[in-house]
Interface confidence: low
């Protein structure tokens, strides 16, 4: 039975040219996290494997940095970065947990961080 929950940074916004930290946190489970995938719609951004460490997709390696923790930092943001991002936790024995973050990249200086929220 999957008892865990994923808390994410929720709906967030940032300025064009800036950077943003995407974070998820898995709680309420004793399952072992074997790997975390970060995906943007259908594209793989990065993988953090418990044994092998981080792998950043070559097409993103100049704009993506690992961390903090199992999170991901996106740099040099463009309006095209607007969209859904997913943290996919592969765990044993529970299986897969997925968290969703929506990022809006704004042209002006009106960007504000959204509230954190939980995805059951």
């Amino acid at each position: 039975m999957m008892t865990g929950t994923i808390e994410t940074t929720g709906n967030i916004s940032a300025e064009k040219g800036g950077s943003i930290i995407l974070q998820c946190h898995l709680s309420s489970t004793t399952a072992q996290v074997t790997q975390v995938n970060w995906e943007q719609q259908d594209q793989l951004l990065a993988i953090c494997n418990a044994d092998l460490g981080w792998h950043i997709s070559p097409s993103f390696k100049d704009r993506v940095a690992p961390g903090p923790g199992l999170g991901l930092t996106l740099q040099s943001l463009t309006v095209n970065d607007t969209g859904e991002y997913f943290c996919i936790y592969h765990t044993y024995p529970d299986g897969t947990y997925t968290g969703r973050i929506f990022l809006e990249v704004l042209e002006s200086s009106v960007a504000e961080h959204g509230a954190r929220f939980q995805i059951p």
Partner: nanobody, 111 residues
Framework: EVQLVESGGGLVQPGGSLRLSCAAS????????MGWFRQAPGKEREWVAS???????WYADSVKGRFTISADNSKNTAYLQMNSLKPEDTAVYYC?????WGQGTLVTVSS
């Protein structure tokens, strides 16, 4: 118990240099990456630089060309060499490794 201890902060004049160290202890494994973040008064914590165990490095645009991150894997220690410091680099600098945080070290750039 995992501990991250930062050191090397202090007061420096604009254009000067500092080298920060972050010693990680208590790990049962070598962290796959270590990073530096900073938080200026009244501002959010921001990422500065990260280094993978294999040596690959990333930098925030604001420090690129001035700061250099490195790691000694055998000592589980990360370093941040900061050159050409500016007043806007003034902040508490934090080390992060495998989701553990240090207490921070204060860097003040002022004449």
């Amino acid at each position: 118990e995992v501990q991250l201890v930062e050191s090397g902060g202090g007061l420096v004049q604009p254009g000067g240099s500092l080298r920060l160290s972050c010693a990680a202890s208590g790990f049962t494994f070598s962290p796959s990456w270590m990073g530096w973040f900073r938080q200026a008064p009244g501002k959010e914590r921001e990422w500065v630089a990260s280094v993978l165990r294999g040596g690959y490095t990333w930098y925030a645009d604001s420090v690129k060309g001035r700061f250099t991150i490195s790691a000694d894997n055998s000592k589980n220690t990360a370093y941040l060499q900061m050159n050409s410091l500016k007043p806007e680099d003034t902040a508490v600098y934090y080390c992060d490794a495998a989701d553990y945080w240090g207490q921070g070290t204060l860097v003040t750039v002022s004449s």
